[in-house]
């Protein structure tokens, strides 16, 4: 059933934990509550996952289908250039940013956006599915 569809929820796919969504070889967690960027990162790490790092435009497009206008933290920071938490550069998309003090990245259904890291937003975790 999981292999037969592009994505599925935990109800139809036991290989991701409860409240996580499966897509491809990964599980995604879309939070309901809000935290600042660091707390969101810590939440993901505590669950053997990481704050969302998007690998390509296809994944980004799919994930944006699940999002509303509300921004969600992703594992993207401006540290001498926009980089994902694993150190890889953001290269398949642009991030809307024109403030030098907004150094954390967030995503909604329309775009990647810079924000002050202390703003409380929802977030997305990602991990390899079992």
């Amino acid at each position: 059933l999981c292999q037969g569809s592009k994505y599925s929820t935990c109800a139809s796919c036991p290989s991701c934990p409860d409240h996580w969504m499966k897509y491809g070889n990964h599980c995604y967690y879309f939070s309901v509550e809000k935290k600042d960027w660091i707390s969101s990162l810590e939440f993901c790490l505590a669950r053997d996952s990481h704050l969302l790092m998007i690998t390509d435009k296809q994944e980004m497009s799919l994930l944006q289908d699940f999002l509303s206008e509300a921004f969600h933290w992703v594992g993207l920071r401006n540290n001498s250039g926009w980089r994902w938490e694993d150190g890889s550069p953001l290269n398949f998309s642009r991030i809307y940013s024109n403030s030098l003090v907004q150094t954390c990245g967030a995503i909604n259904k329309n775009s990647l956006q810079a924000s002050s890291c202390e703003v409380s937003l929802q977030w997305v975790c990602k991990k390899v599915s079992p």
Epitope: D36, F71, Y96, N98, S99, L100, V101, Q102, A106, Q113, A114, S115, S116, E118, V119, S120
Partner: antibody, heavy 125, light 112 residues
Framework: QVILKESGPGILQPSQTLSLTCSFS??????????IGWIRHPSGKALEWLAH???????SYNSALKSRLTISKDTSKNQVFLRLANVATADTATYYC?????????????????WGQGTSVTVSS | DVLLTQTPLSLPVSLGDQASISCRSS???????????LEWYLLKPGQSPKLLIF???NRFSGVPDKFSGSGSGTDFTLKIRRVEAEDLGIYYC?????????FGAGTKLELK
């Protein structure tokens, strides 16, 4: 490149209403986390925050002047407006608009990275 | 309201000197999120204010490292190494941690 520019009447008489416009470019006031504030500088005195407005139309005012202040925006024209009613000579100052950044509290802000050149306002009878 | 008291109000210096400006707040300005939104601005005659330092000690882009900010709680300091003519003007501290945001009275850095 972010640019802000204030415009106003220059001179007005006591009891009149001061109307100021901040025209900006290089960013959109519909973008999450963006705001514009008004600050004034009376000659020989300290800078004073007056009001600001956020991308989501939340507003905040200096409590001592709140009854006289109104801030608004026209995002389609990239403009923010400030009205100060019933002006007195004490309102004579240079008025600046500045872009403000949201950190989670709509009532305040930080990092005024970009400022306009200022517009001089004199209240005199 | 948070009162920011700057000292001195006037600071005469010779070029090449180090200048130090103090900003004391009437209450602790650590925000509940753990950050301290204390900033320093420079206002030169005929110009608009320029952001120098944000969150106590972070230099804004393009601000030379001769400017440094420090402090915590209620006591903050701006230091300027080797003062040059272009550094002269009025320095203001500002806090955005508490409502309403407030400025200090300013410190005029001028030549002796």
């Amino acid at each position: 490149q972010v640019i802000l520019k204030e415009s106003g009447p220059g001179i007005l008489q006591p009891s009149q209403t001061l109307s100021l416009t901040c025209s900006f470019s290089g960013f959109s006031l519909t973008t999450f986390g963006m705001g514009i504030g008004w600050i004034r500088h009376p000659s020989g005195k300290a800078l004073e925050w007056l009001a600001h407005i956020w991308w989501n139309d939340d507003k905040s005012y200096n409590s001592a002047l709140k009854s006289r202040l109104t801030i608004s925006k026209d995002t389609s024209k990239n403009q923010v407006f400030l009205r100060l009613a019933n002006v007195a000579t004490a309102d004579t100052a240079t008025y600046y608009c500045a872009r403000t950044i949201y950190y989670g509290n709509y009532l305040t802000f930080y990092a005024m990275e970009h400022w306009g050149q200022g517009t001089s306002v004199t209240v005199s009878s | 309201d948070v009162l920011l008291t700057q000292t001195p109000l006037s600071l005469p210096v010779s070029l090449g000197d180090q200048a130090s400006i103090s900003c004391r707040s009437s209450q602790n300005i650590v925000h509940s999120n753990g950050n301290t939104y204390l900033e320093w601005y420079l206002l030169k005659p005929g110009q608009s204010p320029k952001l120098l330092i944000f969150k106590v000690s972070n230099r804004f882009s393009g601000v030379p490292d001769k400017f440094s900010g420090s402090g915590s709680g209620t006591d903050f300091t701006l230091k300027i190494r080797r003062v040059e003519a272009e550094d002269l003007g009025i320095y203001y501290c500002f806090q955005g941690s508490h409502v309403p945001p407030t400025f200090g009275a300013g410190t005029k850095l001028e030549l002796k």
